[in-house]
Amino acid sequence: QFLKEGQLAAGTCEIVTLDRCCNKNRRTIARQTARCACRKGQIAGTTRARPACVDARIIKTKQWCDMLPCLEGEGCDLLINRSGWTCTQPGGRIKTTTVS
């Protein structure tokens, strides 16, 4: 099956930049987001620190670490209230992602 221009293969994601006007200085500001073409039963999430299609049950239950959001060799922990997760690098640096 051939993909049309701008069409994503099933189960894949890409990062897109959305421009919107304007801040108080009339500057165009941008927001980056992921665009995913997920299969049935999947939803946009994060795997190995990249946008990915993940099992929708993970999102519903907020078991974020089941997405394997951190890099290999890093530890994953849920934030209090399951509002996101932290990835702990081998040397102890932490990276926190909150889900809005």
Epitope: A49, L71, L79, I80, T86, T88, Q89, P90, G91, G92, R93, I94, K95, T96
Partner: antibody, heavy 114, light 113 residues
Framework: QEQLVESGGRLVTPGTTLTLTCTVS????????VSWVRQAPGKGLEWIGY??????PHYASWAKGRFTISKTSSTTVDLKMTSLTTEDTATYFC?????????WGPGTLVTVSS | ELDLTQTPSSVSAAVGGTVTINCQAS????????LAWYQQKPGQPPKLLIY???TLASGVSSRFKGSGSGTQFTLTISDVQCDDAATYYC?????????????FGGGTELEIL
């Protein structure tokens, strides 16, 4: 709103020990790391060290021994500096260190002069 | 010793022009992409522009573009505006277990003609 504010900067004489405090609001120190960075007048940014909850602090190689970073409460991180010299004259910033350093505090000025 | 070399140290550009700033690390940054760019104006703390080499920080204009991986990174500012006059810094993250966690480049001063 996520905010950091540094305090404790002042004019001191060489050899003094000084402790700066970074007070955070709008986010939890149990979930985020904090870095201390300094900037001498007219110079560039210099990373001093980093602390994350439940982990030992990490320091720039030049800062080891004379600088100590500690989490002193659920909302404060201290930077203790000993044997200060005129070379330590700078604005000291703390910043939430996550995906990049953001946000930053406004900074506190430390002047070391005899 | 960890080192981030930023070039050039100063650059001039006309309004509407394009500026490119380079940052070279003495060793690969963590995950090959943990590099950030900041803008700093006199009397202010630095402002995060880009993290993870190419991801725009919230509310930053898409005129700022980051690229690169490993040890070589670039910040490109297109359609330069008067408000872009500032000093720009790169900051690399490294594994805390083996070296300094962070290092900054020496800065690039952008002057608008």
């Amino acid at each position: 709103q996520e905010q950091l504010v540094e305090s404790g900067g002042r004019l001191v004489t060489p050899g003094t020990t000084l402790t700066l405090t970074c007070t955070v609001s709008g986010f939890s120190l149990s979930s985020y790391g904090v870095s201390w960075v300094r900037q001498a007048p007219g110079k560039g940014l210099e990373w001093i060290g980093y602390i994350a909850n439940n982990y030992n602090p990490h320091y720039a190689s030049w800062a080891k021994g004379r600088f100590t970073i500690s989490k002193t409460s659920s909302t404060t991180v201290d930077l203790k500096m000993t044997s200060l010299t005129t070379e330590d004259t700078a604005t000291y910033f703390c910043a939430r260190d996550n995906y990049g350093m953001d946000p930053w505090g406004p900074g506190t000025l430390v002047t070391v002069s005899s | 010793e960890l080192d981030l070399t930023q070039t050039p140290s100063s650059v001039s550009a006309a309004v509407g022009g394009t500026v490119t700033i380079n940052c070279q690390a003495s060793q690969s940054v963590y995950n090959n992409k943990n590099l950030a760019w900041y803008q700093q104006k006199p009397g202010q703390p630095p402002k995060l522009l880009i993290y993870a080499a190419s991801t725009l920080a919230s509310g930053v204009s898409s005129r700022f573009k980051g690229s690169g991986s490993g040890t070589q990174f670039t910040l490109t500012i297109s359609d330069v505006q008067c408000d872009d006059a500032a000093t720009y810094y790169c900051q690399g993250e490294f594994s805390c277990s083996s070296a300094d966690c962070n290092a900054f480049g020496g800065g690039t001063e952008l002057e608008i003609l």
